[in-house]
């Protein structure tokens, strides 16, 4: 903490300007009025203060606003934001997307810090849901943001926000997250026709159940192997050879290269060898002819 000392004569700051960089820490504390600092925060960023000097400025704002800074100040924090702790940020009430953007800009190019995570959490909670504009902003700064949310948090994402999601934003999502996002994508894109719909829904199909994959197989979609390999194994297993052939279209030949990997490997084990042979790809490992196949899916579903 900086000691309380009187401001030397003639050094009282009339405005926030470059002359202040020559002030010692104790002079800043004594000579800069906190209310003046608050009204001229937008100037701080343009002045090359040292980290120690920024600590003093933060201390002055903390004293002026013990319950948390007003948004008019927060929006112009600039590099002073990097000095904030998550505890400081939890006191804030950030409602403007412009404020959020301004602060994310300060942290641009870095990993998401605890401060940024807290800021985003406060912002989203304040809004009540993760709307499209917010998601647009967050994924622009942090492409993996969506996949950092829990399934419970993702449940509050409105379908319209899904329009802002790019395929790369889903790269690190696990199946539980896609289970939540896929139904929302279905809702969001339901007014689109077949071919357009498939282009949009493709990235979310890792959360699709068997019924939807069967329905897609009737649409001549020609799913590529990369997408097929990301499907849920339990959703792929019940598909017939004919359905997989329709689903993949000309890409069905790619199954041979993937026959040792899930979900293809597990799917092959569930098919009759006779049926696999109709593909003419040399896929091996199916149920031999003459064997009785018991459908245990009913039991699995009930257990």
């Amino acid at each position: 903490e900086v000691e309380k000392t009187a401001c030397p004569s003639g050094k009282k700051a009339r405005e926030i300007d470059e002359s202040l960089i020559f002030y010692k820490k104790w002079e800043l504390e004594a000579c800069v009025d906190a209310a003046l600092l608050a009204t001229q925060m937008d100037r701080v960023n343009a002045i090359p203060f040292t980290y120690e000097q920024l600590d003093v400025l933060k201390h002055k704002l903390d004293e002026l606003y013990p319950q948390g800074y007003p948004e008019s100040v927060i929006q112009h924090l600039g590099y002073l934001f990097l000095k904030m702790s998550p505890e400081d940020i939890r006191k804030w009430n950030v409602t403007s997307l412009e404020t959020l953007k301004a602060l994310l800009e300060v942290n641009k190019g870095h990993e998401m810090s605890p401060q940024v995570a807290t800021l985003i959490d406060r912002f989203v909670k304040g809004r009540g849901q993760l709307d499209k504009d917010t998601l647009d902003t967050l994924t622009a700064f942090y492409p993996g943001y969506l996949c950092s949310l829990s399934p419970e948090e993702l449940s509050s994402v409105p379908p319209s926000s899904i329009w802002a999601v790019r395929p790369q934003d889903l790269d690190t999502c696990d199946p539980r997250q896609l289970d939540v996002l896929y139904p929302k994508a279905r809702l969001a894109f339901q007014n689109m026709n077949g071919s357009e719909y498939f282009v949009k829904i493709q990235s979310f199909l890792g959360g699709a159940p068997t019924e939807d994959l069967k329905a897609l197989s009737q649409q001549n979609v020609s799913m590529d192997l990369a997408t097929f390999m990301k499907l849920r194994t339990d959703a792929v297993l019940p598909l017939t050879v004919a359905e997989v052939q329709k689903l993949l279209g000309p890409h069905v030949e790619g199954l041979k290269a993937e026959e040792r990997h899930r979900p293809v490997r597990d799917w092959i084990l569930r098919q009759r060898q006779d049926d696999l042979d109709t593909l003419g790809l040399g896929l091996q490992g199916g149920i031999p002819n003459g064997y009785l196949v018991l459908d245990l899916s009913m039991q699995e579903a009930l257990s």
Partner: antibody, heavy 122, light 106 residues
């Protein structure tokens, strides 16, 4: 034949909560998307939200956000809709409606419950 | 918020054609559904995705949708078709129902 059977009529005081159930009978092995729609006396239909087959994903109409919760008990093929902080204007018949038709972008309300009248009165 | 406007009532003689309109901004860009509701009963889906009929719905029910208007047409209207009819679309995070049209068979 597939049927959706809803819980009985309820009378609630303002500020209270109500939980309406909707049980599928018939083809209970398969699970489907379930909508909830309400209809105030003499008024039109109003969509409240939807829950997906596994119950992990819900989408609520903005108007009910924060007041409505939809859940699903897959073991009993029952879906629940809870509405909190009730006010007199929530007096309505509440319907569950299941999406039975297939189609990747299909959400038609194919099978409807008989409706549950919820009366909010002090 | 998105609004769908329907005429409050439509009257038709038995055997004639009843047309119910549903108006909304750029409605033709969305898929429209239609629901029939008889007094004291739950609604029934009669048309989905503009012009498709669920199984069990008579062929006399048909639909179209373009521009700002979706239309439900009941050709050869029967007394049993007397009911309220609601159009419905998905728009920005919600399903929107039309104001409803009471069809009276004279």
């Amino acid at each position: 034949e597939v049927q959706l059977v809803q819980s009985g009529a309820e009378v609630k005081k303002p500020g209270a909560s109500v939980k309406v159930s909707c049980k599928a009978s018939g083809d209970t092995f398969k699970r489907y998307y379930m909508h909830w729609v309400r209809q105030a006396p003499g008024q039109g239909l109003e969509w409240m939200g939807i829950i997906n087959p596994s119950g992990v994903s819900t989408t609520y109409a903005q108007k009910f956000q924060g007041r409505v919760t939809m859940t699903r008990d897959t073991s009993t093929s029952t879906v629940y809709m809870e509405l909190s902080s009730l006010r007199s204007e929530d007096t309505a018949v509440y319907y569950c409606a299941e999406v039975r038709g297939s189609g990747f972008n299909y959400f038609g309300m194919d099978v409807w419950g008989q409706g549950t009248l919820v009366t909010v009165s002090s | 918020s998105y609004e769908l406007t329907q005429p409050p009532s439509v009257s038709v003689s038995p055997g004639q054609t009843a047309s119910i309109t549903c108006s909304g901004d750029k409605l033709g860009d969305k898929y429209a559904s239609w629901y029939q509701q008889k007094p004291g009963q739950s609604p029934v889906l009669v048309i989905y995705q503009d012009n498709r009929r669920p199984s069990g719905i008579p062929e006399r029910f048909s639909g179209s949708n373009s521009g700002n208007t979706a239309t439900l047409t009941i050709s050869g209207t029967q007394a049993m078709d007397e009911a309220d009819y609601y159009c419905q679309v998905w728009d920005s995070d919600t399903y929107v129902f039309g104001t409803g049209t009471k069809v009276t068979v004279l």
